[in-house]
Structure formats: structure tokens, C-alpha cells
Interface confidence: low
């Protein structure tokens, strides 16, 4: 009868719907797992960025301090070379004076 | 009849199944969107990490170079101070000799 045909079609549609539901459920679970993983990676990566930024800031400031120290030492070397030069000149002058006297 | 009752129950079950399917489909779409967003964030963050790492490596190597330069300059300062000291001593000695002669 038409009734039983409709019923049979309904049962088939219901079975198909159940299959689709299971398939979607599996897909959803897989996608949720992937999402969790991607979020964890993003969070972990953000922490790495913070860490690297801290490290970089520290090294930048260290480089600036070292640059200042280099400048200071270079000035010191220049000054000492100048003093040495003056002393040598004085020494030579005094030697000349000694020789002439 | 029993047949029509079973059919009615079947139709109700099918309607419920359809609702569940729609709900799952919506959830899946939302989760896929979130996944795409999280993956994009993770990728973008990973690029930032690479950039920061490169900068940090450069700074680390720059700091080492500067450290070597500081050491070199400090040695130079020590050497020059020593030379100055020697010259001063020589100068004093020669002054004493001059006074005594």
C-alpha cells in the first residue's frame, strides 16, 4: 500500500539521516581536536614571542651599553696615546737640552 | 493502526534527526571558521618568531663581537697605561740624573 511504501521510504530517509549525523559528529570531533591543537600552538607561540622579545630587549640594551663602553674605551685610548705622545716629545726635548748643555 | 503509529513515530524521529543534522552542520561550520582563524594566528605568530629569532641571533653575535672589541680595547688601555708608567719613571730618573750631574 501507499502507506507502507511511504513508511519504507521514511525509514530509508531516517537511516540516511542517521548516517549523515554520525559522519557530521565525527567531522566535528576531528575539527574540534584540530582547533584545540591550533589554539594551543598559537598560545605557545605567543609565549615564545614574549620570551624572544624579552631576550631581544635585553640584548639590545646590552649592545647599547657595550657600545657606550667601546666609545669610552676608544676615548681613553685616544687620550692615553696623546699623553704618550706629549711625554715622548718632552723626553726628546729634555734629551736635546741635556746634550746641548 | 499499528502501521500508522509506527509511521508517525518514524516521521517524528526523522524530523528530530534533521534538526540534529542542522545543528551539527552549524556547529561544524563555526568550528571550521575558528580553526581557520587559529591556524592563521599560529602561522602569523610563527613568522614573528622566525623574525625575532633572526634579530636575536644577530644581536647575540653583535654582543659577542662587541665583547671581543671591549677586551681588545681594555688590553690596549692596560698596555698604554704601562707604557705611560714606564715613560714617567724614565722621565723621573732622567730628571734626577740631570739634577745630580
Amino acid at each position: 500500500t501507499a502507506n507502507s511504501v511511504a513508511c519504507r521510504d521514511g525509514l530509508r530517509a531516517q537511516a540516511e539521516c542517521r548516517n549523515t549525523t554520525h559522519l557530521l559528529q565525527r567531522q566535528l570531533t576531528r575539527t574540534q581536536d584540530s582547533l584545540l591543537q591550533a589554539e594551543t600552538q598559537a598560545n605557545s607561540c605567543n609565549l615564545t614571542v614574549v620570551t624572544l622579545q624579552e631576550s631581544l630587549e635585553k640584548k639590545v640594551s646590552q649592545a647599547l651599553e657595550q657600545q657606550a663602553r667601546i666609545k669610552e674605551l676608544e676615548n681613553e685610548v685616544t687620550k692615553l696615546n696623546q699623553e704618550l705622545e706629549n711625554l715622548r716629545i718632552q723626553k726628546e726635548t729634555s734629551s736635546t737640552v741635556q746634550v746641548n748643555s | 493502526t499499528a502501521n500508522s503509529v509506527a509511521c508517525r513515530d518514524g516521521l517524528r524521529a526523522q524530523a528530530e534527526c534533521r534538526n540534529t543534522t542542522h545543528l551539527l552542520q552549524r556547529q561544524l561550520t563555526r568550528t571550521q571558521d575558528s580553526l581557520l582563524q587559529a591556524e592563521t594566528q599560529a602561522n602569523s605568530c610563527n613568522l614573528t618568531v622566525v623574525t625575532l629569532q633572526e634579530s636575536l641571533e644577530k644581536k647575540v653575535s653583535q654582543a659577542l663581537e662587541q665583547q671581543a672589541r671591549i677586551k681588545e680595547l681594555e688590553n690596549e688601555v692596560t698596555k698604554l697605561n704601562q707604557e705611560l708608567e714606564n715613560l714617567r719613571i724614565q722621565k723621573e730618573t732622567s730628571s734626577t740624573v740631570q739634577v745630580n750631574s
Epitope: L47, T48, T51, E54 | -
Partner: antibody
């Protein structure tokens, strides 16, 4: 001179609670993160947690929920421990931790959990 | 969560010898790594921070190196007073820190 002194360590029965204190001198607490580290007899160092300059706290995963770090005054940092077990028997060190490096340590205070 | 894997757990060398120990971080920690020396009955003493910077007053025979996840502490010209347990401490992000299990260094 800069100094950290831990106090309050004593014998406690399992399940009990205890608060130990770190008193600082010569240090401006507002400028440093302060941490707690413990060491069970004959074992290695174990990081418990840290309190930042803005009073934000971070804990090792095993310490979350049972351990609480707080700045109780301008010179003291407390470590509150609850639901203590024999596994918590250790010397507890207070540490000043700027820039990711714990650079100043107290001498430690011994906490013993036993019935 | 950050895990620090330290190797070896113990080692020995003669006076004047060289000792090397390693620390591996489970995450990329840049140069946020410190090394400590601990002798029995004493609190740990900072040797090296930011992977390679010597703490003040630390002899130059101690050398730290590494970046990212792999770090090394080398003691060149081992002295009797260097016999101790050495720990690495990694920092990840602002608050996450973890110690290695330690390396016991003895004199032969």
C-alpha cells in the same frame, strides 16, 4: 645589603596548612618579581611559582590550587600551602627573580610534614 | 608547561680537566636560561644568565652557550672548589619557569 630571609618552617601534620614568609632587606619589592623554589632532602630544585611586579602570580602546574604567593607588605612575600602531604617535606627558598634569572636566594626554611 | 631535560645526571673529571653538561628545553626559550651551582647545605649560586652572560664574580672558566632549545655549560680547567651540583633554569614567557634535574660533578 640585599638579603632574603625565610621564616615559618616547622613540623606540620598531613592535611594541614602552613604559611611561610620571606622578609627582604635592602630591596625595593615593587621593582622585582619574587619566586619560591623548594628542594626535598637529597633531591633537585623544584620551581613553585612567582609573583610579578604587578602582583600577577604564575605557578608550576603541580602547585596550582594548593600554593598561593602574595606580597603581604613592602618587605614581605608569603607562600601559603594547603592540604600538605609528606611529599611537600622540603627546604623552601625565597628567590629574587629579575629578567628570568633568580639572582638572589635566601638560606631556606625547612618544612616537615609528618604524623 | 616547560620541561628541562638535563644530562648527564653525574660526571667526574680530574683537576684541570673539562666538564660539559647539557640542558634541553621542551619549548623555544630563546636565551632565557640560567645555570646555578649548589654545594651541600647551601642555596644555589647564580653562575650564568641569558644563556652565556657570566654573573658577577664568576670565574671565566665557566662558559654558557646555546639558543632556543639546546644549551651547554662548560667548565674548562676544573678546580677542586667546582665539585658541586649544577642546575639549569629555563624561563618561557613571563612566568613559566622550570629547573633541570641537576648534574652532579665530582673530582676524580
Amino acid at each position: 645589603q640585599e638579603q632574603l630571609v625565610e621564616s615559618g618552617g616547622r613540623l606540620v601534620t598531613p592535611g594541614g596548612s602552613l604559611t611561610i614568609t620571606c622578609t627582604v632587606s635592602g630591596i625595593d619589592l615593587s621593582g622585582y618579581a619574587m619566586g619560591w623554589v623548594r628542594q626535598a632532602p637529597g633531591k633537585g630544585l623544584e620551581y613553585i611559582g612567582i609573583i610579578g611586579t604587578s602582583d600577577t602570580t604564575y605557578y608550576a602546574s603541580w602547585a596550582k590550587g594548593r600554593f598561593t604567593i602574595s606580597k603581604t607588605s613592602s618587605t614581605t612575600v608569603d607562600l601559603k600551602m594547603t592540604s600538605l602531604t609528606t611529599e611537600d617535606t622540603a627546604t623552601y627558598f625565597c628567590v629574587r627573580s629579575p629578567g628570568g634569572s633568580a639572582d638572589l636566594w635566601g638560606q631556606g626554611t625547612l618544612v616537615t610534614i609528618s604524623s | 608547561e616547560l620541561d628541562m631535560t638535563q644530562t648527564p645526571s653525574s660526571t667526574s673529571t680530574a683537576v684541570g680537566g673539562t666538564v660539559t653538561m647539557n640542558c634541553q628545553a621542551s619549548q623555544n626559550i630563546g636565551i632565557n636560561l640560567a645555570w646555578y651551582q649548589q654545594k651541600p647545605g647551601q642555596p644555589p649560586k647564580l653562575l650564568i644568565w641569558y644563556a652565556s652572560d657570566l654573573a658577577s664574580g664568576v670565574p671565566s672558566r665557566f662558559k654558557g652557550s646555546g639558543f632556543g632549545t639546546q644549551f651547554t655549560l662548560t667548565i674548562s680547567g676544573m678546580q677542586r672548589e667546582d665539585a658541586a651540583t649544577y642546575y639549569c633554569l629555563g624561563t618561557y614567557g613571563s612566568g613559566v619557569r622550570a629547573f633541570g634535574a641537576g648534574t652532579n660533578v665530582e673530582i676524580k
